[in-house]
Interface confidence: low
């Protein structure tokens, strides 16, 4: 798949930021702010938590989530999974693209200890027009939102 | 803001590296090496710890800092904040762009235990000509410098 | 070194993924999948674990490795080093480019506790045609492979 950068052509890019509405608790992907503050879309679209590709090519996609808690709540998995996933017309299920597993909870030796951790993912993937990329965090109860600078999601064509 | 890549145009990029002089202890941003070793500036400028934008556009900005210590020194905050901040003529205060909070100290259960951690940040932001981006770490006493490969700061136009 | 993006020119990029054969135990660099699944090479070559540059320029290079274990095995270093290194005709030894040190083991307070951690590195470096970049992890026994989404290595020209 030869992908070319033609002169005078806008390079697709986006940076979406975490907001109070990001965590749905529904088991779905995280939702994102697309316009306010640092958030923008340029040559990419957005729908229900997903960056939607309008132009096929190779994209560097990335996401960071801020994790935090007080001790380890009972029933909370010791492993946090943060991942970027693709939804495509060619497959019925989401496809894992980039994934991290962390055990940040284990840092807090006492049950009342406050802890923070951050997970960053980034990598180049090929995306077709119409394909979607979403971010998931399991368990999302540990994601700490504030002002859009600590948890975010973005992409740009390379 | 439509940003175009014209043919035969050099794409702004920079990679600055940690040096002995990076940690000032003055409460200011980290300072960086701009020329020696792996460090370079291409289409961007540098001033007092800041990458200075000479051409408006969307930039992927990034920073990594190497953290480390022996146990948790008394008086040391349990939370380390590592962030990229923007200085702009339009606002008197720095603006948070990308931020991480970590509690690496909590890993060391005994007071004499050596620990290491690393914090990476990266994301796309829009920057105007003349705007500056800096890196801050609180508490900077935990930043471990060596040869410019473990703590660094960079950007490139996307 | 002025590097230009000419119109209609393919931009070098690659994303290599972790596979069962990645960990050699030989003290050499990690090996990678170059074709299956998410892995690809475009304007870059691959040889014995290394991305080989075919066109000189500035490249954003990156790697993520998934770490994990059960407690801290005896004889296992408390520090994990994950780095990107350059091999060049001009020097007999590998050159450190981007490096992280982490102490993930310290999170597990009991010897039977399962822990996970992830290390991400990314930065812009100048590479000449024929130069190579490899990934090393010490101690590689803690790298956890699965399906190519958790440990990977890539680059693209900026």
């Amino acid at each position: 798949l030869i992908q070319e950068r033609r002169s005078h052509e806008v390079n697709p890019a986006a940076h979406l930021t975490g907001a109070n509405s990001s965590l749905t608790g529904s088991g779905g992907p995280l939702l994102w702010e697309t316009q306010l503050g640092l958030a923008f879309l340029r040559g990419l679209s957005y729908h229900d938590g997903a960056l939607v590709v309008t132009k096929a090519g190779y994209y560097y996609i990335y996401s960071k989530v801020q994790l935090g808690g007080v001790g380890c709540p009972l029933g909370l998995a010791s492993t946090i999974t943060h991942g970027l996933y693709k939804r495509t017309p060619r497959y019925p299920e989401e496809l894992e693209l980039l994934v991290s597993q962390q055990s940040p909870c284990g840092r807090a030796t006492s049950s009342s200890r406050v802890w923070w951790d951050s997970s960053f993912l980034g990598g180049v993937v090929h995306l077709e027009a119409g394909e979607k990329v979403v971010v998931r965090v399991l368990d999302e109860r540990l994601v700490r939102l504030r002002d859009g600078t600590r948890s975010y999601f973005g992409a740009f064509m390379v | 803001l439509i940003q175009e890549r014209r043919s035969h145009e050099v794409n702004p990029a920079a990679h600055l590296t940690g040096a002995n002089s990076s940690l000032t202890g003055s409460g200011g941003p980290l300072l960086w090496e701009t020329q020696l070793g792996l460090a370079f500036l291409r289409g961007l400028s540098y001033h007092d710890g800041a990458l200075v934008v000479t051409k408006a556009g969307y930039y992927y900005i990034y920073s990594k800092v190497q953290l480390g210590g022996v146990g948790c020194p008394l008086g040391l905050a349990s939370t380390i904040t590592h962030g990229l901040y923007k200085r702009t003529p339009r606002y008197p205060e720095e603006l948070e762009l990308l931020v991480s909070q970590q509690s690496p100290c909590g890993r060391a259960t005994s007071s004499s235990r050596v620990w290491w951690d690393s914090s990476f940040l990266g994301g796309v932001v829009h920057l105007e000509a003349g705007e500056k981006v800096v890196v801050r770490v609180l508490d900077e006493r935990l930043v471990r410098l060596r040869d410019g490969t473990r703590s660094y700061f960079g950007a490139f136009m996307v | 070194l002025i590097q230009e993006r000419r119109s209609h020119e393919v931009n070098p990029a690659a994303h290599l993924t972790g596979a069962n054969s990645s960990l050699t135990g030989s003290g050499g660099p990690l090996l990678w999948e170059t074709q299956l699944g998410l892995a690809f090479l475009r304007g870059l070559s691959y040889h014995d674990g290394a991305l080989v540059v075919t066109k000189a320029g500035y490249y954003y290079i990156y790697s993520k490795v998934q770490l994990g274990g059960v407690g801290c095995p005896l004889g296992l270093a408390s520090t994990i080093t994950h780095g990107l290194y350059k091999r060049t005709p001009r020097y007999p030894e590998e050159l450190e480019l981007l490096v992280s040190q982490q102490s993930p083991c310290g999170r597990a307070t009991s010897s039977s506790r399962v822990w996970w951690d992830s290390s991400f590195l990314g930065g812009v470096v100048h590479l000449e045609a024929g130069e190579k970049v490899v990934v090393r992890v010490l101690d590689e026994r803690l790298v956890r492979l699965r399906d190519g989404t958790r440990s990977y290595f890539g680059a693209f020209m900026v």
Partner: antibody, heavy 122, light 107 residues
Amino acid sequence: QVQLVQSGAEVKKPGASVKVSCKASGYTFTSYYIHWVRQAPGQRLEWMGWIFPGSDITKYNEKFKGRVTITRDTSASTAYMELSSLRSEDTAVYYCAREDYGISTYSAMDFWGQGTLVTVSS
Amino acid sequence: DIQLTQSPSFLSASVGDRVTITCKASQDVGTAVAWYQQKPGKAPKLLIYWASTRHTGVPSRFSGSGSGTEFTLTISSLQPEDFATYYCQQYSSYPLTFGQGTKVEIK
């Protein structure tokens, strides 16, 4: 200018060994790989292995492993290829060639020796 | 091992003709491909490396293209001294391998 000069033709009996030399001049011998490639009559070129003269590192084609040994003498700027347990199908022209990049890189072979014909016949 | 298959194996052409030789790899080799010219009784000469980069001193009528598994050597205007056998070679993975060759003859 870069030159690779090989030793003369050899006739050997099956089971014997042959050692072909390749003397380099016009460049820094220790900074470039030397490859050995052979070509049987009417056949395609076949890579046998290389040596990096600066550190004596070698890499061999598995097909020849155990039968081929590549060595060098830095003081004489000369590389050697020895092939043992010769058989009739080893009859070929053997070439040494320099790789055009230095250590830890991979590329094409930009300068070749003139070739050495090795005939294996009883 | 990576197999390289050249086509055609033989080619008859006249001076001034445009000649195209293809090389197909059995697996992705990126752009780690070289082309050589060999005349009878002589050693091969490097023409193209990294799929499309002309070696020093090689005339501009020789050009290479391709990536992945399909590569092409083109001689834009055949000259009398170009009648020879041409080989492609991959150096993406060991063992290094060559194509079977394409012999360009005078028509």
